[in-house]
Every structure is written in C-alpha cells, then in structure tokens.
C-alpha cells in the first residue's frame, strides 16, 4: 500500500481542505473510527487501485487515526494496513470527545493502561491529575493516544491550556477487579558474552508482594551455586526483582537460564527461560552472500547492504579503491550501520544519483579487538545505450555503406534490419535482419572500444550493401541490459537523383 502523503503524522489547518490517497494492487479503502468515510475509488492504467479521501472544511473533530487497508483482505498475502494520524489544531475543541465506555477502565491484572484524553494540537502541554488533586502526575503523554502507565484505582482528569483558558477533560475512572496470576519476565544485560566477562540476568515479577524465586542454570547442575540478590523496585509498586550475577564467565556457563516464581497464597507459578552464549573470543561473521560484481544504473540511487553478526560491537569502515569513505556533505554518499538485534548488524552504503566516477572496487571492513571481516566487490555503472550517429555514404566502389556508432555499458549488441517495402514495413511486414546471413548482398564489420575514462563501450558497425535497386529503410538497433535505442536511415539507389 502506498499512501500520499506518507505521514505518519500530519498537522493540518482548521477550515482547510486536504486530500489523502492510497493505492495498492487490489481495491483499497480508507477507514476512520472503524467506518468508511465517503471516498472515491479510482484506477490507473497499470492496474493499480486507488482511493481518494477528500477532507473538506477541517475541524478539530477530524483529529485522529486514519487507516488505509485492502477493501477485501481475504485472499491477499498480508492483511496490510497503513496508519496516518492527523491533527487539526482547533481552539474551539478542548479534549476530543470519548465514548462513555472509554471513561471507565477496568483491569483484571496489573498492566499498563492508557487514559485516552487527546487534544487537537500536538503543541499543547497536557497534564494528568487525580480528580481531587492539583499536582500533575509524572506519567508520559502521547498526543496520539493519551497517558500510558500503571494506575491505581482512582479517578483522573487531564488538563491543558488553550490560549488563556484552562480546559479540563471528562473524568476517567480506573477500577482493578482482581490481581492477576504471576507474570514473569527475564532479561539479560547481554545474551552473548566473552569468557572472563560477567553474566547478569534479571527476573522481574509484577503485582505480588511475597514470592519465591528459584533459578536453574548450567553452573548449578555441576554443583557450583550462585546466590541471587532479590530487591524491590521502589519507584514501581509491587515490582520484585531477582538478580543472578556470575562474574568472570566460563565457556561451560553457556546454556539455558530459567527463573521460576511461585507465590503460596493462590499457589500460582510462572517461569521464563533465556539462552546465554559464552564465546572464547569475540567474532565477526558475514551473513548471506554479496556477489563480487554489483551493478548500479547511471543517475539512479543504489543501496549496497551487508549483513553480519558481531560481538562485541564492531567498528565499520567502507573503502572505495582503498580510500576511506564517509558521509558526503553534498549528500551523494550515505553510510549507516544499524544494530538490528543484540549481535546482528546491517551496514548500508547508499550512492545517491550514481555517477560514472563511482564505479570501482568497494570494501566494507568490520572489526574489533578480537576479529575482523572484509567484504569486497566491484561496482559497475550501467549506462543505457545511445545511438550517437547513423550515416550513409556512397564510396566510389559502387557499394553503399551505412555506419552506426553508439555507446553504453555493459557492451551493447548491435542489430541491423531493413525494410524493402516502405509502405508496408514495419507495420504489416517484419523487417529483415541483416548481416548475419551468408548472402553476398550485405557485409558487416563491427569494432568495439572500451573508453576507460567514461567507463563505457563504444560500438562502431559498418554495413556494406552491394546492390541497392530501390529505396531501403535501414535500421540500427543497439541493446544492452539497461535499454535499447534505434535510429533509421533511408538508403536510395545510386540511380535515383534524390534522397528521402
């Protein structure tokens, strides 16, 4: 799905008009608050379907989420949805209205909830208060959603100031119906460590005051016990944490670490496990293949991507022809290395509007104190073919010659063809291919030159026609992997006093 404008957040003027379009390979539809607002469906010649949502005379009440989705997602690969959030700052609208059921928030367990007080202007400062208190509560606010956090059984209101007037929201009521069963989460500072480094794991249980932790881990099975430390997270009520700390890890400490939590009141229990890997030394490993020859098309942008695993975090450098590359201030080159998981990295070199000079030998080097890896490839810049010249001449020998010259990268192929019946060819009759037959009536001579500076091939082909008895349309077509180009010339017999 392609949405224009792409968002994901727009701030629009009150009373204005705004158009949203969404297109996809199947019929698409805009949705707002689980309904389909009036919109127009359209179609492009390439078979793409579009829907146009024209928002006119915008008010603050148009603030909110807009979704584009396939009209009938059955039978489609993915149930894809694109979300857009629109703000229409409107001083006449304080807080956006809520349905009655949104004002009552019921909980069956201690969990993060959202008090959905929303305003029309993302610049407004919004504060949350207990209904009977003036002190603003330290809860994070998202202008698109509201205040999110863990709330006690109380009544809450939101406040903001629009111009010089203070505006209060409706009251929101939070009710906790019962405390949930145990919910355990386990995480590690790192799941991969080198021998000699520390392993630190944390097991957190929420919503219970008295619990028992039990850890199982590889070292325990060999009789070497580690004493965990249990503490209460004072800033978060009813959060109890057990910390298992193993200093100076050994290879044998690799394996599964399990935290089992029980509480005796309701006889509830839960356990979670995590895998830890201890490595002898750090590593850098390439993932997937990158061909030694890569291609880019002239004046198009090209991103070259390398995926690798590493621990500890590596330094990544890119080189071209053994010279270090950096982000160019002109925006022609962009380098980025992203940490996509704890030990997995994606490094990207983006060439913007590729130039011929950017062809060459590229190397990515990722390294740290323990290991390094290099990946190199040759970048070839492909240039669409152009026919630069197609000319005809009459040497004294009596034969007639047609010369075709063109350039491109990779090396262009040349195809000669001719039409003898100018009225019917090429529309009704196919052109005749020349030069590849054993006939004596035409001879072909082709030379190819590689121009180092321009990094492209030049093809010069001369077609000798032994006997031309009537006007002949001769066509020279050059083709390569990224395009083709054609020119034609009319060759007339010597005997005719004019040329068409």
């Amino acid at each position: 799905l392609v949405v224009t404008p792409p968002g994901p957040e727009l701030v629009l003027n009150v009373s204005s008009t705004f158009v949203l379009t969404c297109s996809g390979s199947a019929p698409v539809v805009w949705e707002r608050m689980s309904q389909e607002p009036p919109q127009e469906m359209a179609k492009a010649q390439d078979g793409t379907f579009s829907s146009v949502l024209t928002l006119t005379n915008l008010t603050g009440l148009d603030t909110g989420e807009y979704f584009c989705t396939h009209n009938d997602s059955r039978g489609l690969e993915t149930d894809e949805r694109k979300r857009l959030y629109i703000f229409v700052p409107d001083p006449t609208v304080g807080f956006l209205p809520n349905d009655a059921e949104e004002l009552f928030i019921f909980l069956t367990e201690i969990t993060e909830i959202t008090i959905p007080c929303r305003v029309t202007d993302p610049q407004l400062v919004v504060t949350l208060h207990e209904k009977k208190g003036d002190v603003a509560l330290p809860v994070p606010y998202d202008h698109q959603r509201g205040f999110s956090g863990i709330f006690e059984d109380r009544s809450y209101i939101c406040k903001t100031t629009i111009g010089d007037r203070e505006v209060d929201s409706d009251a929101y009521y939070v009710y906790r119906l019962q405390v949930s069963s145990i919910n355990v989460s386990v995480n590690a500072v790192q799941t991969v460590v080198r021998q000699g480094e520390n392993i630190t794991l944390m097991c957190i249980v929420i919503g219970n005051e008295v619990v028992n932790f039990e850890w199982t881990y590889p070292r325990k099975e060999s009789g070497r016990l580690v004493e965990p430390v249990t503490d209460f997270l004072l800033d978060m009520p009813y959060h109890i944490r057990s910390i298992l700390h193993i200093p100076s890890a050994e290879l044998e400490d690799s394996g599964t670490y399990t935290c089992n939590v029980t509480e005796s009141v309701n006889d509830h229990q839960d356990e979670k496990a995590i895998n830890i890997t201890v490595v002898e030394s750090g590593y850098v490993r390439l993932l997937g293949e990158v061909g030694t020859l890569q291609f880019a098309e002239l004046h198009r942008s090209r991103t070259l991507q390398v995926v690798f695993e590493a621990y500890p975090p590596p330094t990544v450098l890119w080189f071209k022809d053994n010279r270090t590359l950096g982000d160019s201030s002109a925006g022609e080159i962009a380098l980025s290395t992203r940490n996509v998981s704890e030990t997995r990295y994606v490094s990207e070199l983006t060439l913007v509007r590729v130039k011929v000079a950017e062809a060459g030998h590229y190397t990515m080097r990722a390294f740290h104190e323990d290991a390094e890896v290099q990946l190199s490839f040759q970048l070839q810049i492909n240039v669409p073919v152009r026919v630069l010249e197609l000319s005809e001449s009459h040497p004294d020998s009596g034969e007639q010659t047609v010369r075709c010259r063109g350039r491109g990268m990779p090396q262009p192929n040349i195809i000669w063809s001719a039409c003898r019946d100018l009225k019917r060819c090429p529309r009704e009759l196919p052109p005749t291919l020349l030069g590849n037959s054993s006939e004596e009536e035409s001879q072909l001579e082709t030379n190819v030159t590689y121009w180092e500076e321009e990094q492209e091939f030049e093809v010069v082909s001369t077609l000798r026609l032994q006997h031309v008895d009537r006007p002949l349309s001769v066509r020279c077509t050059l083709r390569n992997a990224v395009g083709q180009d054609t020119q034609e010339v009319i060759v007339v017999p010597h005997s005719l006093p004019f040329k068409v």
Epitope: V2, T4, P5, L10, V11, L12, N13, S16, T17, F18, V19, T21, S23, A44, Q45, D46, T48
Partner: nanobody, 115 residues
Framework: EVQLVESGGALVQPGGSLRLSCAAS????????MGWYRQAPGKQREVVTF???????NYVDSVEGRFTISRDNAKNTMYLQMNSLKPEDTAVYYC?????????WGQGTQVTVSS
C-alpha cells in the same frame, strides 16, 4: 500557496470534446497531488481524476477511457481532455493541487453537455 485558475469550460453537445486548463501561479514540479474534481447541482464535490508525485494517472470508473489528465511543468499547467462527453458530465469542474500540508482550489469552470 499557489493560486489556480481554470479555463476551457463551455456548452458542448453530447459526444463532443473539451479541454480544460488549470494554470498555477507558481511552479508545479514539487506538487504531491493534483486532480480534477466536479460538482453537479445538488451533489457533493467528487474527484474525477488525479496524479500523485511519481504515480500514474488515476480515473474513476465513470470517466475511464474518455478523460485524460496531463501536466506541463514548463507552463505550470494541468489539463483535462474530455472526450465522448455525456449529459451526466455536466458540472462545475475544479482543479486542486496539494504540496506538503497546503492545498489550493481553483474557482471552477462550468461544463454543460446538452443538445
């Protein structure tokens, strides 16, 4: 914001053709969305055809194959070629252009299809 001026509206017989123009006061190269809308008497304004930046022309079913939208960046003008006109095409035609979060309407031009 660009100012838009439509022209080309007229009275035309069924089956006839018209070409509407929408001239912009500034450059249209970076326009994200440009389209033609129409409003028949007593009805809502509705889109007829549009182009988004980098996209192909799109048409609603009722005009597909008869109407063609095009643009001339050098003249800062958008066009609507209307062929095989029908009485139900009678309406005031408006052009609309949008860049970023700013949109502009033209003042409208009347197209009447009648024998």
């Amino acid at each position: 914001e660009v100012q838009l001026v439509e022209s080309g509206g007229a009275l035309v017989q069924p089956g006839g053709s018209l070409r509407l123009s929408c001239a912009a006061s500034g450059s249209i190269v970076s326009i994200d969305f440009m389209g033609w809308y129409r409003q028949a008497p007593g009805k809502q304004r509705e889109v007829v055809t549009f182009i988004t930046s980098g996209g192909s022309p799109n048409y609603v079913d009722s005009v597909e194959g008869r109407f063609t939208i095009s643009r001339d960046n050098a003249k800062n003008t958008m066009y609507l070629q209307m062929n095989s006109l029908k009485p139900e095409d009678t309406a005031v035609y408006y052009c609309y252009m949008q860049s970023g979060t700013a949109g502009s309407w033209g003042q409208g031009t009347q197209v009447t299809v009648s024998s």
